[in-house]
Interface confidence: low
């Protein structure tokens, strides 16, 4: 039993590793778009076992406008930087290369993503020819942690932030 | 290339700190949550803390709730672990990941990406 291919999550793209039972996968927004604090990226492929038909969990993945971005105006033709400082990137982004062998679900093709395994210890080799990221994944046998019946966290948000699941209320982004 | 790297780990004796530190590279900080799990020799691996860098929202399992303390630096893509009043059941390895604070309790805790982790030991 498999997943057909996931929905659409607007600005945002996923790479479906596998569609098979039980499988998690991870959306992740378009450039220019951050993920609202709160909602969840995570989408998992279940069983209805009143039909015994997979379907994927809808994620609670908002996609807002990096507010980083909205307010930046567009540099003027020729600047002067007097203090000898060189502007530095605010984070760092994923490589953008696009895994081989993956069909994206989009509504944005044109949007460059990074792969995310999940519960996959990241050992990346850069490929001689082409210089893009390759992500192995590698199992307990090889040191990482146990992906056995991992226990639920039971965590407690702190000051005034609701527990985890919980969405914050009255959050000042808008889409 | 995403990489995470765990330091600060040692021998301490209960009732002493740690800080443990994590040097993040290669994605971008606001878009994940990061934390902190562990896991104990012959135990299930435990999640101890989260934050959500979007917001800043931190997160604490009840087992280390007033103890640990969450924070990060993201000018320099660092998180940090202050542990104090370190007790023997905090003893275990432990790693930095990211991972989604929302949907922990929902789908059991999914650590995307971790660390080569960094080992505790707490003497009594």
């Known amino acids: 039993i498999t997943c057909p291919p996931p929905m659409s999550v607007e600005h945002a793209d996923i790479w479906v590793k596998s569609y098979s039972l039980y499988s998690r996968e991870r959306y992740i927004c378009n450039s220019g778009f951050k993920r609202k604090a709160g909602t969840s990226s995570l989408t998992e492929c279940v069983l209805n076992k009143a039909t015994n038909v997979a379907h994927w969990t809808t994620p609670s993945l908002k996609c807002i406008r990096d507010p980083a971005l909205v307010h930046q105006r567009p540099a003027p033709p020729s600047t002067v930087t007097t203090a000898g400082v060189t502007p530095q990137p605010e984070s760092l982004s994923p490589s953008g290369k696009e895994p081989a062998a993956s069909s994206p679900s989009s509504n944005n093709t044109a949007a460059t993503t990074a792969a995310i395994v999940p519960g996959s210890q990241l050992m990346p080799s850069k490929s001689p020819s082409t210089g893009t990221t390759e992500i192995s994944s590698h199992e307990s046998s090889h040191g990482t942690p146990s992906q056995t019946t991992a226990k639920n966290w039971e965590l407690t948000a702190s000051a005034s932030h609701q527990p985890p699941g919980v969405y914050p209320q009255g959050h000042s982004d808008t889409t | 290339e995403v990489q995470l790297v765990e330091s600060g780990g040692g021998l301490v004796q209960a009732g002493g700190s740690l800080r443990l530190s994590c040097a993040a590279s290669g994605f971008t900080f606001d878009d994940y949550a990061i934390g902190w799990f562990r896991q104990a020799p012959g135990k299930e691996r435990e999640g101890v803390s989260c934050m959500d860098s979007s917001d800043g929202s931190t997160y604490y399992a009840d087992s280390v709730k007033g103890r640990f303390t969450i924070s990060s630096d993201n000018a320099k893509n660092m998180v940090y672990l202050q542990m104090n009043s370190l007790k023997v059941e905090d003893t275990a390895v432990y790693y930095c990941?990211?991972?989604?604070?929302?949907?922990?309790?929902?789908?059991?805790?999914?650590?995307?990406?971790w660390g080569q982790g960094t080992q505790v030991t707490v003497s009594s």
């Open positions: 990941a990211i991972l989604d604070c929302a949907v922990v309790t929902t789908l059991g805790g999914e650590y995307d990406y």
